[in-house]
């Protein structure tokens, strides 16, 4: 049951991690104005991986698309790749992992065909969580770079007086989100490696021997060890905590959001 | 058609107060702002402030902050400006404006009112 | 406060010609986020409050006539009134609306030759 649980949650975790991924990825706030030490402007510029918008004041708000695949910066394809790669493979992960789940019967799969497919499936939340924080991180650190370069720059102007005061874009709300999603894909996918320890059966049955004695025909078979040792010739390996009542389905409450602006 | 009607000309001591009101009407009021301005008499304009209706947030010209108040009451659809400790240099005429959804500036405004500061 | 610098402060155009306003501002009012320029035109005629004729330097209000057009970007820009009509004469003001406070120029006056 131990077992069960550990991949269900698992499941669980990492299915909400790769929403956040998805989301992450999709969001425009990546990137936003920094409004601390700036003059106040009626106008407010937030970035993300597809597109940048201009919010005024007056609630008009205007989108536009990055058009060009040449034109941008490396860092930014690369992220863009990065959480590409994470969402497909955590997509894959999901797929696999539905079908290892033990609580889900298909046919007449073996528990070592279902251990395989949980540790597939973990190995690729684990990639997957791995592909999204790195891809966060390489555009909070372009950012970081971006936003001193831009502070040095910020105050340079002929005779003291300043032309243009240059926007410094500062952590947007999709980092936070793609870090947390990223650390709880990682941890489903850890969850459903363990749970592929306890699902995979043991090889190490011993096979029956026959041992002659000298003028007798009586073969003895190793029998008596079968309850203390737990080996025998039951190659099913049943297991003692698959029996019971199931408790896959235990609610799980998250905390509410509440925004206070 | 969108209208901001303000109300009438006022004749105000020094050192008194005068509330000036702005009823709009004509379109959905939540989600605009509405701007005060005043113009002295053979001046430029001067912005003095904005309230957002629908959320109360309000804005002011750090010039004018400690001597004006900027309300609203949205179940009459009116903006009120209050300007306190007058001086005769504040003999103006008081505009509301409404804020466009485009380019941050004013697209629709009232017909003014007349404040004159005199002892 | 961003400080808006009108020219001329007055101006005699005759009917049909063309009339050219400047306005230059203290701080550029260019949007990297989208390439505007946050500055607008007005115009007033006597007795009036003031009219919206142009909106981010160069986008022309539904309802004006295409005569009245507006050019510029960062901190330089022109109103051109390229055949000036009778009906247009009038006190014509840029505003800074890209910084708050929001601040207008000093007006410039067109009057009829």
């Known amino acids: 049951m131990a077992v069960t649980a550990c991949q269900g949650l698992g499941f669980v975790v990492s299915l909400i991690g790769i929403a956040g991924i998805i989301a992450a990825t999709c969001m425009d706030q990546w990137s936003t104005q920094d409004l601390y030490n700036n003059p106040v402007t009626a106008v407010f510029n937030y970035q993300g991986l597809w597109r940048s918008c201009v919010r005024e004041s007056s609630g008009f708000t205007e989108c536009r698309g990055y058009f060009t695949l040449l034109g941008l910066p490396a860092m930014l394809q690369a992220v863009r790749a990065l959480m590409i790669v994470g969402i497909v493979l955590g997509a894959i992960g999901l797929l696999v992992s539905i079908f290892a789940l033990k609580c889900i019967r298909i046919g007449s799969m073996e528990d070592s065909a279902k251990a395989n497919m949980t540790l597939t499936s973990g190995i690729m939340f684990i990639v997957s969580g791995l592909c999204a924080i790195a891809g966060v991180s390489v555009f909070a650190n372009m950012l970081v770079t971006n936003f001193w370069m831009s502070t040095a720059n910020m105050y340079t102007g002929m005779g003291g007086m300043v032309q243009t005061v240059q926007t410094r874009y500062t952590f947007g709300a999709a980092l936070f989100v793609g870090w947390v999603a990223g650390g709880l894909t990682l941890i489903g996918g850890v969850m459903m490696c363990i749970a592929c320890r306890g699902l995979a059966p043991e090889e190490t049955n011993y096979k029956a021997v026959s041992y002659h004695a000298s003028g007798h025909s009586v073969a003895y078979k190793p029998g008596g060890f079968k309850a203390s040792t737990g080996f025998g010739s039951n190659t099913k390996n049943k297991k003692i905590y698959d029996g019971g009542a199931r408790t896959e389905d235990e609610v799980q409450s998250y905390p509410s959001k509440h925004d206070y602006v | 058609q969108v209208q901001l009607v303000q109300s009438g000309a006022e004749v105000k001591k020094p050192g008194s107060s005068v509330k000036v009101s702005c009823k709009a009407s004509g379109y959905t009021l939540t989600g605009y702002w509405i701007e005060w301005l005043r113009q002295r008499p053979g001046q430029g304009l001067e912005w003095m402030g904005e309230?957002?209706?629908?959320?109360?947030?309000?804005k002011y010209n750090v010039k004018f902050k400690d001597r004006v108040t900027i309300t609203a009451d949205e179940s009459t659809s009116t903006a009120y400006m209050e300007l306190s400790s007058l001086r005769s240099e504040d003999t103006a005429v008081y505009y509301c404006a409404r804020k466009g959804l485009r380019g941050n500036s004013f697209d629709y405004w009232g017909q003014g009112t007349l404040v004159t500061v005199s002892s | 406060d961003i400080v808006m610098t009108q020219s001329p402060s007055s101006l005699t155009v005759s009917l049909g010609e063309k009339a050219t306003i400047s306005c230059k501002s203290s701080q550029s009012l260019l949007n990297s986020g989208n390439q505007k320029s946050y500055l607008t035109w007005y115009q007033q005629k006597p007795g009036q409050p003031p009219k919206r004729l142009i909106y981010?330097?160069?986008t022309r209000e539904s309802g004006v006539p295409d005569r009245f057009s507006g050019s510029g970007s960062g901190t330089d820009f022109t109103l051109t009134i390229s055949s000036l009509q009778a009906e247009d004469l009038a006190v014509y003001y840029c505003q800074n609306d890209y910084y708050y406070p929001f601040t207008f120029g000093q007006g410039t006056k067109v009057e009829i030759k």
């Open positions: 309230i957002l209706l629908g959320s109360g947030s309000i």
């Open positions: 981010w330097a160069s």
